[in-house]
Amino acid sequence: KSPIFGPEEVNSVEGNSVSITCYYPPTSVNRHTRKYWCRQGARGGCITLISSEGYVSSKYAGRANLTNFPENGTFVVNIAQLSQDDSGRYKCGLGINSRGLSFDVSLEVSQGPGLLNDTKVYTVDLGRTVTINCPFKTENAQKRKSLYKQIGLYPVLVIDSSGYVNPNYTGRIRLDIQGTGQLLFSVVINQLRLSDAGQYLCQAGDDSNSNKKNADLQVLKPEPELVYEDLRGSVTFHCALGPEVANVAKFLCRQSSGENCDVVVNTLGKRAPAFEGRILLNPQDKDGSFSVVITGLRKEDAGRYLCGAHSDGQLQEGSPIQAWQLFVNEESTIPRSPTVVKGVAGGSVAVLCPYNRKESKSIKYWCLWEGAQNGRCPLLVDSEGWVKAQYEGRLSLLEEPGNGTFTVILNQLTSRDAGFYWCLTNGDTLWRTTVEIKIIEGEPNLKVPGNVTAVLGETLKVPCHFPCKFSSYEKYWCKWNNTGCQALPSQDEGPSKAFVNCDENSRLVSLTLNLVTRADEGWYWCGVKQGHFYGETAAVYVAVEERKAAGSRDVSLAKADAAPDEKVLDSGFREIENKAIQDPRLFAEEKAVADTRDQADGSRASVDSGSSEEQGGSSR
């Protein structure tokens, strides 16, 4: 018994397309072996029509393709412009046609609906443009040209060469008469509506010698592409409507009851509140195509989505559209992670970001979602050692705890840090999560002095006061740099006196820098962690100056400056241009992301805003 499986019977009509999926066990050998589609002959042979190695029979030229999806263990044969001659018995299979790893498929193509003789069939998508060509003879060259539509038993005039236009077609139809050399006139109808479908008759002349040509216009409502994504994952809708609408406002909407389609996002700046923080509409290409990324998929996001083009930025009759049916799989591989993390002004947050554990070597990124215009997400930090200049000293991306999770720590929080942030990688585009940082009332738990000045050649001791709530946590000091925060030795100096109502379990832990050098200048963090899970941090900037008087410096909280709201960094810090995630295909299509800092970064991230879990900033 062959392990290949597919549809036993496929039925269609002339002029239509079919898409035949064949399933195979996705073993390593099967994934890479030849895939084929062949037609069975009367004597038992099977003639290859198309294969995964590039062969296409002349019978299929320009109307068929075969696509292998090795990760799913499937391959798909698409055949367009079907005729009754395509009816017959076929095999889809792996390897060599005669070897038996195949599945029998019966394709039956029946005649389409009855048409008048000499009828030209035009099949056009909703919202697009059709050109109906009407030949005539020399004797009718100077006579009236007209197009009628058959409504029931009666032909109704649509347009004619004397300037008449039927009100149903106003503003979207024209009649062109070709130059004297060509005996042809054409009628162009754009923004096609479903109601435009039907039988048409073109006519040149009005007497018994007139030339007539029948046309059958079929207007296709786009069949929705089925998209099946995981809860908490992300989806990208790629919308290619054609260059003719390149300068028209674009939209993505979700169909609600009946024919209503509620705008999710459009290029006129509208965005549905339910998608705040988790949607990007990527700038359109010159050909008018664009894409929309939605992250943090929720159960209620399932449904039918349409993208289209219309000056109003919403669905109207005659809008060219593309359709998707989104199904959200609740058996998600993407773990739950907090959707809201809270921190206090001056304090810190530690955000856990999930990623596909099979892609531990992927580059990790963190970006700040901005709602202006169509949404963008400028990168703030990556795992390759880049940090946006304004975040130097207060932002770090750590590979810990690993195995499917990385950590982002942001300290010296201000109210301006409130907002939505996306975790993403240059690997699996479905693994993107969004977290909202909220700044709440309160005091930071860790107490450190403000900026500190050390003297060259002397010893500096910097205190960090930990309240008793962190008694069971590991306490550490580290020196911040672009790639993380390198741990430094520290001394436990016993209980702290910095906290009221705090017992012996509070702690004062000091960082000591002996024989200070210029290299010691920079940002230092004290913090708490449990194993590989990080909690709160506090930052101190240590400046180094020339010796003025001998001795060592012991900095206390009282002597320290107040922690600055904004840091003005040494002019030597390299300013790196603003990088924004704008093109989600960048990662999807495996374009080189060797140094994303030098390009407008694409990425695809996911949010779990469907869950109401919240994570405090001070502890895990």
């Epitope: 019977e9 079919v18 898409s19 199904f327």
Partner: nanobody
Framework: QVQLVESGGGWVQTGGSLRLSCAAS????????MGWFRQTPGKEREFVAA??????????YYTDSAKGRFTISRDNAKNTVYLQMNSLKPEDTAVYYC?????????????????WGQGTQVTVSS
């Protein structure tokens, strides 16, 4: 969700025929696989046949034991799927279930728990 109601089961002798119906309500099932499965006591549900359609193209899938004997079909206007079972054998005795799921992936698997009918008993006696 799609609500599914099966009917048409019953008792028949070996070699006889039955026609099962599955009426779907709640939403149109044009973007779904509609499948027939069967289950005998103490065994897992097994795939029998499935149908899907896109526009005016229809795709029919059968398990090996159903090929040549069973025919799956649909009536769009009634939002109903049928399983015509001919040349029935005692081993076809089972509870037959109708199921629906999004038209993605292998039609033999991944049907959600809440998209099943209540089942109809088919008994074939020798």
């Amino acid at each position: 969700q799609v609500q599914l109601v099966e009917s048409g089961g019953g008792w028949v002798q070996t070699g006889g025929s039955l026609r099962l119906s599955c009426a779907a309500s709640g939403r149109t099932v044009s973007s779904y696989y509609m499948g027939w499965f069967r289950q005998t006591p103490g065994k897992e549900r097994e795939f029998v046949a499935a149908i899907s359609w896109v526009g005016s193209s229809t795709y029919k899938y059968y398990t090996d034991s159903a090929k040549g004997r069973f025919t799956i079909s649909r009536d769009n206007a009634k939002n109903t799927v049928y399983l015509q079972m001919n040349s029935l054998k005692p081993e076809d005795t089972a509870v037959y279930y109708c199921a629906a799921r999004p038209r993605v992936g292998d039609p033999r698997s991944r049907y959600d728990d809440d998209n099943w009918g209540q089942g109809t008993q088919v008994t074939v006696s020798s």
